[in-house]
Amino acid sequence: ILGGREAEAHARPYMASVQLNGAHLCGGVLVAEQWVLSAAHCLEDAADGKVQVLLGAHSLSQPEPSKRLYDVLRAVPHPDSQPDTIDHDLLLLQLSEKATLGPAVRPLPWQRVDRDVAPGTLCDVAGWGIVNHAGRRPDSLQHVLLPVLDRATCNRATHHDGAITERLMCAESNRRDSCKGDSGGPLVCGGVLEGVVTSGSRVCGNAKKPGIYTRVASYAAWIDSVLA
């Protein structure tokens, strides 16, 4: 997260750290007791590694009573996700067991109504992704409030040049932005999960390259079918 600040500890109980061989890889969001939603690209290079999900965390390194690391029983990338595109960049991770719920671990309601979030709406994005251009890794969860950007502006030739389909949304990125390591994390508007950070370009904090988020409402049928 660029230009953000440390989040209030455990105030986002849905927040997950998807880890590869014990290191934070991507964000994720608890959407059901045994399921975490993240980004498909996160597992592209994880073939030989051990993927786990950390729940109930604020600090990645410090002991916290609510923290627990779960093994992954099953990883389900969206069937249409591909390495070279940002489309359909969703992944569902089934935990080895149901998460122990409590004040610091709680699923987040996700948007099912397939309607665009109004441009200008302030949405919260959180993660343990890098916070500067030298790869500074935060130990504690960071967050930032970002205004939703209309699709027409986001699709300008100077911006994302038509790449933003109806199944994607954008948020402003002028010095405040999601960044590498935040992929898979939640974009929350009005207390509801609206988007998932895509594993796209490494350009962060550049106003001409708005952050791209996968609209979960557009994938409601797929999410429901996997969770069923």
Epitope: N21, S61, N132, A134, G135, R136, R137, P138, K180
Partner: antibody
Framework: QVQLQQPGAELVRPGTSVKLSCKAS????????MHWVKQRPGQGLEWIGV????????NYNQKFKGKATLTVDTSSSTAYMQLSSLTSEDSAVYYC???????????WGQGTSVTVSS | DIQMTQTTSSLSASLGDRVTISCRAS??????LNWYQQKPDGTVKLLIY???RLHSGVPSRFSGSGSGTDYSLTISNLEQEDFATYFC?????????FGGGTKLEIK
């Protein structure tokens, strides 16, 4: 356990180049950026720059742009720093350090001592 | 660039003592302050980051504190292996910069 292995010493001629290596083990190489730091005899430490092994993105201290070039070989989990147009000012110990939390370097190599002499 | 100043370049102490090493930044570094130990053979280890979190494997006799521009490292109950040089480093603003070091010597 995390280990960063660096050769002990390099003796090089003025005006030439040298490529220093830092072989990582005990962790997933592409998951952590790698820093390089310079220490002149009896002096403090200077940050040279950092590289992300997952895509070779680099960020340099302005002072070392044109002097240092950072690269990686992910197949051997090795980070490299090439120093060019060497002068006596480049005689120093050079460390690699794994990117830790909050701008720290959590594991360091033993350092390579570079002596520039004719 | 942010200047990091360790006013005490050397410090003498005895086994079992408690010592405090200070570090001042030329501007607010928002707690992005780290401490390292360098042994005479050149070996460097991270002790503390941000600015009071103990790196894994570091004994609890080491502690850090501070905010804004002023930070300190405290070593309680000094042991033989603690006699070394200690550097502070700011990780707030590029380029990252280090203090000049404080050499802790045996009295």
């Amino acid at each position: 356990q995390v280990q960063l292995q660096q050769p002990g010493a390099e003796l090089v001629r003025p005006g030439t180049s040298v490529k220093l290596s830092c072989k990582a083990s005990g962790y997933t190489f592409t998951s952590y950026w790698m820093h390089w730091v310079k220490q002149r005899p009896g002096q403090g430490l200077e940050w040279i720059g950092v590289i992300d092994p997952s895509d070779s993105y680099t960020n340099y201290n302005q002072k070392f742009k044109g002097k240092a070039t950072l690269t990686v070989d992910t197949s051997s989990s090795t980070a490299y720093m090439q120093l060019s147009s060497l002068t006596s000012e480049d005689s120093a110990v050079y460390y690699c350090g794994r990117n830790g939390y909050d701008g720290s370097m959590d594991y360091w190599g033993q350092g390579t001592s570079v002596t520039v002499s004719s | 660039d942010i200047q990091m100043t360790q006013t005490t370049s050397s410090l003498s102490a005895s086994l079992g003592d408690r010592v405090t090493i200070s570090c001042r930044a030329s501007q607010d570094i928002s707690n992005y302050l780290n401490w390292y130990q360098q042994k005479p053979d050149g070996t460097v280890k991270l002790l503390i980051y941000y600015p009071s979190r103990l790196h894994s494997g570091v004994p609890s006799r080491f502690s850090g504190s501070g905010s804004g521009t002023d930070y300190s490292l405290t070593i309680s109950n000094l042991e033989q292996e603690d006699f070394a040089t200690y550097f502070c480093q700011q990780g707030n603003t590029l380029p990252y910069t280090f203090g000049g070091g404080t050499k802790l010597e045996i009295k």
